[in-house]
């Protein structure tokens, strides 16, 4: 008895990070053999889309025209050929950016720092969030991920770095995004580079406690005052 | 492209209302909260309040507390602003625009209210 | 609520010359726990709504021209357009974001000499 299907590969073009309104191609590799290729969303009515194969039959392709919330999500695709249904493919996260304004990406207390001395990266969002993300730029994945705990809302996070080294400099940008759909992210903040200076050299970085606190009432302009406890954040390395 | 788009100018007697319309295009609508300007005839800005489409949460201004009423329609991407009890110091042109991080990004076109016996 | 005085009213520069417009605000609008200065810069022309030139008092608005330039902390700010063209022609007004209710100045009217 032959062995189930090998499972299809998904991938979209031009990445799985797409801004609103722009679009994306999903596809899905099979075999040969495949008759229909099926793309499934989560939390959505399966299928979500059913697609004929291009030739020579052994992948498909689903098309987004214009990125929307609606489309956010995690997918999976499947084959079928004369002896069933594949094994599903590797879920595939599709992320909108643009789904709020974009935060603000401080250092502190400036982003001219020392080697050896300790830096604090300080997003803000216009509206309360409970998911930061820290991104540096050419890194591969997120560098520093914060989720509140509690689903408490806030309007800031802070991402401490001490002790700073030359492996810390470069440019990076916040999102924001909120937890009933962390494939919907803000704008990008604008970007903060960070120059470190000094020959101290430690290439193992260990970043401190993550810190996000309740907008406060003197010093956070525009922020709600007493709008939320204290919960912090929880730190997520990816 | 953004574009936030408004409706046409009103007349209007002193004592009625008004409700104008922002039409929002180009973005994500629910995410951005959307704020309302007046400019009266040759002089300066002057910020009503805000309203936040995701959740209808809305702020005014003290001077236009009670008579100014913003509220939205999600379905078509609209925000609306209703201006009551209308004297001749509101004719003005009113403006929607888009806040990014309280300051304002993008701007409707204005909607021209006057207000004449 | 914070008030924001704009000088001069008005201003008449010769083209490819250096204008001035300056803003002061009634409190501080350098925000302790990010060091920013919550102030934006509009420009309006005839006709038109206001177009964001500059925030965080010296950042420039993406596809905004480098001859335009925000500068100062605290209370006091200064938009520079460092050569002055015929399209600049226009009434410029700063705007506070650090409280609400958001005010603005009167705006400074600007010509050419």
């Known amino acids: 008895q032959a062995g189930p299907l090998p499972k299809p590969t998904l991938w979209a073009e031009p990445g799985s990070v797409i801004s609103w309104g722009n679009s994306v191609t999903i596809w899905c590799q099979g075999t040969l053999e495949a008759r229909e290729y099926r793309l499934d969303k989560e939390e959505s009515p399966a299928p979500w889309d059913r697609q004929n194969p291009l030739e020579p039959k052994n992948k498909a392709r689903f098309s987004i025209p214009s990125m929307t919330e609606d489309y956010a999500g995690r997918y999976r695709c499947y084959y079928r050929s004369p002896v069933g249904w594949s094994q599903p493919s590797d879920p595939l996260e599709l992320v909108m950016t643009g789904a709020y304004s974009k935060p603000t990406l401080s250092a502190l207390p400036s982003p001219l720092v020392t080697s050896g001395k300790s830096v604090t990266l300080l997003c803000q969002s216009r509206s309360p969030m409970d998911t930061f993300l820290l991104i540096k730029e050419r890194a591969a994945h997120p560098l520093l991920h914060l989720r509140s705990e509690h689903g408490a809302q806030q309007h800031q996070a802070e991402f401490p770095m001490s002790p700073v080294t030359s492996v810390h400099g470069g440019t990076y940008r916040c999102f924001s995004s909120h937890g009933f759909s962390h494939y919907l992210l803000s704008h990008p903040s604008d970007p903060l580079e960070l120059i470190v200076s000094g020959s101290l050299e430690d290439p193992r970085p260990s970043p401190t406690r993550s810190v996000s606190t309740a907008a406060g009432p003197e010093d956070q302009p525009l922020m709600p005052t007493g709008s939320v406890p204290h919960s912090g954040l929880r730190r997520h390395w990816e | 492209e953004v574009q936030l788009v408004q409706s046409g100018a009103e007349v209007k007697k002193p004592g009625a209302s008004v409700k104008v319309s922002c039409k929002a295009s180009?973005?994500?609508?629910?995410?951005?909260?959307i704020d309302w300007v007046k400019q009266p005839p040759g002089k300066g800005l002057e910020w009503i309040g805000y309203?936040?489409?995701?959740?209808?949460?809305?702020s005014y201004n003290q001077k236009f507390k009670g008579r100014a009423t913003m509220t939205v329609d999600k379905s078509t991407s609209t925000v609306y602003m209703e201006l009551s009890s209308l004297r001749s110091e509101d004719t003005a042109v009113y403006y929607c625009?888009?806040?990014?991080?309280?300051?304002?990004?993008?701007w409707g076109q204005g909607t021209t209210v006057t207000v004449s016996s | 609520d914070i008030v924001m005085t704009q000088s001069p009213d008005s201003l008449a520069v010769s083209l490819g010359e250096r204008a001035t417009i300056n803003c002061k605000s009634s409190?501080?609008?350098?925000?302790?726990?990010?060091?920013?200065?919550?102030l934006a810069w509009y420009q309006q022309k005839p006709g038109q709504p206001p177009k964001l030139l500059i925030y965080?008092?010296?950042t420039r608005e993406s596809g905004v021209p480098d001859r335009f330039a925000g500068s100062g902390s605290g209370t006091d700010f200064t938009l520079t357009i460092s050569s002055l063209q015929a399209e600049d022609v226009a009434v410029y007004y700063c705007?506070?974001?650090?409280?609400?209710?958001?005010?603005f100045g009167q705006g400074t009217k600007l010509e050419i000499k």
């Open positions: 180009g973005y994500s609508f629910t995410g951005f909260y």
């Open positions: 965080w008092a010296s």
């Open positions: 625009a888009r806040q990014a991080f309280y300051y304002f990004d993008y």
């Open positions: 409190q501080s609008l350098l925000s302790s726990s990010n060091q920013k200065n919550y």
């Open positions: 309203i936040f489409p995701s959740n209808g949460e809305t």
């Open positions: 705007q506070q974001y650090y409280s609400y209710p958001l005010t």
